[in-house]
């Protein structure tokens, strides 16, 4: 006979979370980002799939669209016009790449209440969108433009060249997508849908990735996609506008590159409309330490599109690359010809700018041993923009107001103080004029997205507040998590610990170290998440940690630029110090330290685990990067310039997985990789394994067919299932 | 240009009903969205109901399955049936026109106006 153990009543009903919780996203959040139409209405599809108008300032809401128009076309997605006369209904969705999908478009005519009959959209179509005002459409079909008056009339074909694989008109290529816009689309049109400008990506001369698609055929497909390697062909790109009111009147006309960036390999990196009649253009050289802006106007005497070199505007780097991960846009005022910009200071700290003649003359806006990230809208009086400044973190977004009225500005922290414990990182979406704006806060705490006006910043109402979600995390017991830096060699190392919920610093445990790594990436972050590794800390007890060493952003560009050139080496450096720092604190049981990461985070776990310090017992890499003359030349030569004697040839072979095989031998390590990737290619892992063999060293390896680079669907639970076993084995947990 | 004239207002007990009417000049009366908006002292002006050129309603949710909007293309008039009134309906009740569609809540986007008939809900 045993006696009952007194509980306190709440511990008992406490349990840690389970893998499958996070395989059945038990605990993920919603957030609620308005789908504004004016400045002071916005749309949102209710829980029950009525698309409803919500007015702000009556605070009544109207049913505009109901399910069951909805469900007669399976639609997934819609588009209400300018004018409020048609929807665009979205269905048969399917993927292509990261942002790239294929779809059905059916248009609804809201005064009738019908779908429109005749002239109907072919399909798939590849992106369609509507004109800024009024109900014009653009569409791209079969790689070419197709331009509506009107939904129910014929369309006008602009482009005649597109083919598959070859020319892309209004809507990019491969890498394009991936790495420079990155969008689906192409296209843009002018703020009051008189002009339609795109771009023509010519793929001709790029080499093709093959790989094959298994399926359920008697033979695999082969899939082909022109892929740029580093070092490789690129595309090349060029930049039309046509008049939309008189399509076939002068037809589309080219907008002139820039003769200091045409001179050699280029890209175009982005298109901002000024005015109907000004659009602005970025620029970029293959070596990617240059970036040049270009203000140009419409001649209205011969219908052509004017680039003088007075409105040219040269953004370089002598220390690292032009931007973070991309060069920043430009946020034009109301003159139509100055704009604010974020690029780094004079310290080395990527900060707002107005530029009004030249870059030279800028006037700096922000300033500090902090980042200005992105500027959400420019008013009259107010430009809204978030930094990491508050309580330097270099992991929290808040969100500024400077008042750009009076002189000299005043700067108000909108976030700051709101909800300080349970919310450190925000976004947000502002209504036109910024009238209103909804904030969206991903933690650390619960997220809840709230509703503002514009000009008191005073709460309006919340619009979603996650309460399913805290009582259903009521009885979990949650690993505790903790944000804080390490001072190494004049370098700050800011680290996330995640640790069991019953922490005990006098005890030991296991350590799994977290990588991603990648330039201008950012793992230490103030957000709130259940996932995988909240699992390994409340059910299996393990210690997790995420460091952002060198190469990472936010922090000013000594730290971004340190491993500019030199991929694979600060990095992983930066890892096992933080490693030894924490072996250094007590509570780590040495002989228990394993690291993993996916794709950039893999060739990091990689390399960490082949560094010969034996720290590591044992590591997983999911998709790796295996030598960079393996990935895509935009974001490789980005960081690493190129493959040639003359250039970085020596570093791109020093830099590979496949160079410290040998290594491998006295670690357990675990290699996984999706057959379908077509963004890191299954020749990285194929080539790590293919070494391994070579040097007889043992190690474990799972493919996942016809899987890409996400390893989604039915893969994720068999992945996760996977590696748990693995991380389990290595650190002598029972099952 | 659009001339409106409302009518059909009054004093009524809750859960009553009340038909306002509004009678509009033009020719061109069949292509225009016509809008019942209302307003209660210190409120914004808010649309209740609203009618397509193709016939096609929308209301305020408050107001939804109470509130009958229709339209007379024959006699130019548009009606606005009101039934379970609630003392919260108390306001003026404005009869609204524009050119287009009809799904614009805001009073800024309707440009031509009736000069307002008053609507009382007594409980």
């Known amino acids: 006979l045993r006696p009952s153990r007194v509980h306190n009543s709440e511990e008992n009903t406490m349990r840690a979370l389970t893998l499958k919780d996070i395989l059945n996203g038990t605990f993920s959040y919603k957030t609620f980002f308005p789908n504004w139409i004016s400045g002071q209405e916005y749309l949102h599809q209710s829980a029950d799939n009525n698309i409803v108008l919500y007015n702000i300032e009556t605070g009544q809401s109207y049913t505009i669209l109901s399910n069951r128009t909805m469900k007669s076309v399976n639609a997934s997605n819609y588009g209400l016009s300018p004018d409020r006369q048609f929807v665009y209904l979205e269905s048969d969705y399917s993927k292509l790449w990261r942002y790239s999908y294929t779809a059905t478009y059916y248009i609804y005519d809201l005064s009738n209440g019908e779908f429109v009959r005749g002239n109907e959209l072919p399909r798939p179509i590849q992106y369609l969108c509507w004109s800024p005002v009024g109900s014009k459409l653009a569409y791209v079909y079969q790689n070419n433009i197709y331009l509506k008056q009107r939904p129910g009339d014929p369309p006008f074909q602009i482009t005649f060249n597109g083919r598959e694989n070859k020319i892309f008109n209004g809507i990019p290529d491969w890498v394009y997508e991936e790495e420079m816009l990155p969008t689906k689309y192409a296209l843009w049109w002018s703020p009051n849908g008189k002009f339609l400008a795109y771009a023509e990506f010519n793929d001709k001369d790029i080499p093709v990735i093959a790989y094959s698609y298994y399926g359920d055929e008697q033979y695999p497909r082969t899939i082909n996609i022109p892929y740029p390697k580093a070092g490789a062909k690129n595309p090349v790109v060029r930049i039309f506008i046509i008049d939309t009111t008189y399509p076939a009147y002068v037809g589309p006309q080219e907008v002139p590159v820039p003769a200091m960036i045409a001179s050699s390999d280029y890209y175009f990196s982005w298109l901002t409309w000024v005015t109907d009649e000004r659009v602005c253009l970025q620029w970029l050289k293959r070596v990617q330490n240059v970036s040049v802006l270009s203000i140009c106007d419409f001649r209205e005497d011969w219908q052509t599109w004017d680039c003088p070199k007075t409105q040219e505007h040269i953004e370089e780097s002598r220390t690292g690359w032009a931007g973070g991960f991309f060069v920043s846009r430009p946020v034009f005022s109301y003159d139509a010809i100055s704009y604010y910009k974020i690029f780094s200071d004079k310290d080395g700290y990527k900060h707002i700018h107005y530029i009004k003649d030249t870059v030279e003359n800028a006037i700096q806006i922000t300033s500090g041993k902090w980042e200005a990230i992105n500027i959400f809208r420019v008013t009259q009086d107010s430009l809204f923009y978030s930094s990491n400044e508050f309580e330097e973190y270099p992991g929290r977004r808040n969100i500024y107001r400077i008042s750009i009225g009076s002189y000299p500005p005043s700067k108000k922290c909108v976030t700051c103080h709101l909800r300080k414990e349970r919310c450190q990182y925000y976004t947000a979406s502002f209504s036109d004029y910024a009238k209103y704006y909804a904030l969206v806060c991903y933690g650390p705490g619960i997220p809840i997205s709230t509703l503002h006006d514009g000009r008191t910043d005073q709460e309006i109402k919340i619009l979603e507040e996650n309460k399913e979600l805290e009582n259903a995390l009521k009885n979990i017991q949650l690993p505790k998590e903790e944000i804080k830096k390490l001072e190494v060699d004049e370098i700050t190392l800011w680290y996330k610990m995640i640790l069991p919920p019953q922490f005990d610093r006098s005890k030991k445990y296991p350590l799994l170290i977290q990588v991603y790594g990648g330039p201008c990436s950012q793992s230490v972050r103030s957000v709130f998440a259940v996932n995988w590794i909240s699992y390994l800390a409340s059910k299996e007890g393990m210690v997790i940690a995420l460091v952002d060493g060198r190469g990472t952003a936010f922090q000013g560009d000594k730290l971004l630029y340190a491993v500019y050139r030199k991929l694979g080496v600060y990095e992983v450096e930066d890892q096992i110090t933080a490693v030894r720092k924490f072996i250094e604190m007590g509570f780590i049981d040495e002989k228990r330290i394993a690291i993993w990461g996916w794709s950039y985070g893999g060739y990091v776990s990689s390399l960490a685990l082949a560094s010969g310090t034996g720290l590591f017992k044992c590591g997983i890499a999911v998709a790796p990067v295996s030598s960079w003359e393996y990935y895509a030349s935009v974001y490789t030569e980005r960081f690493m310039g190129l493959p040639t004697k003359d250039d970085n040839l020596e570093h791109y072979k020093n830099s590979t997985v496949m160079a410290r095989a040998e290594y491998f031998r006295n670690v357990d390590y675990l290699l996984i990789h999706g057959t379908a990737d077509d963004n890191v290619h299954f020749q990285n892992s194929a080539q790590i394994a293919k070494a391994l063999v070579n040097a007889q060293v043992d190690f474990q390896a799972m493919w996942y067919s016809d899987q890409n680079h996400g390893l989604s669907g039915l893969s994720t639970n068999h992945l996760y299932t996977h590696m748990t076993h693995f991380l389990k084995q290595c650190f002598s947990l029972s099952d | 240009q659009v001339q409106l004239q409302e009518s059909g207002g009054g004093l009524v007990q809750a859960e009553g009903s009340l038909r306002l009417s509004c009678a509009a000049s033009?020719?061109?009366?069949?292509?225009?969205?016509m809008g019942w908006f209302r307003q209660a002292p210190g409120k914004e002006r808010e649309l209740v109901a609203g009618?397509?050129?193709?016939?096609?309603?929308n209301y305020a949710h408050s107001v939804k399955g109470r509130f009958t909007i229709s339209r007379d293309i024959d006699k130019n008039t548009v009606f606005l049936q009101m039934n379970s009134l609630k003392p919260e309906d108390t306001a003026v009740y404005y009869c609204?026109?524009?050119?287009?569609?009809?799904?614009?809540?805001?009073?800024?986007?309707?440009?031509?106006w009736g000069q307002g008939t008053q609507v009382t809900v007594s409980s």
């Open positions: 609204a026109a524009r050119s287009g569609g009809a799904y614009y809540t805001s009073r800024v986007d309707w440009p031509y």
């Open positions: 033009g020719r061109t009366f069949g292509s225009y969205a």
């Open positions: 009618i397509s050129s193709g016939g096609i309603t």
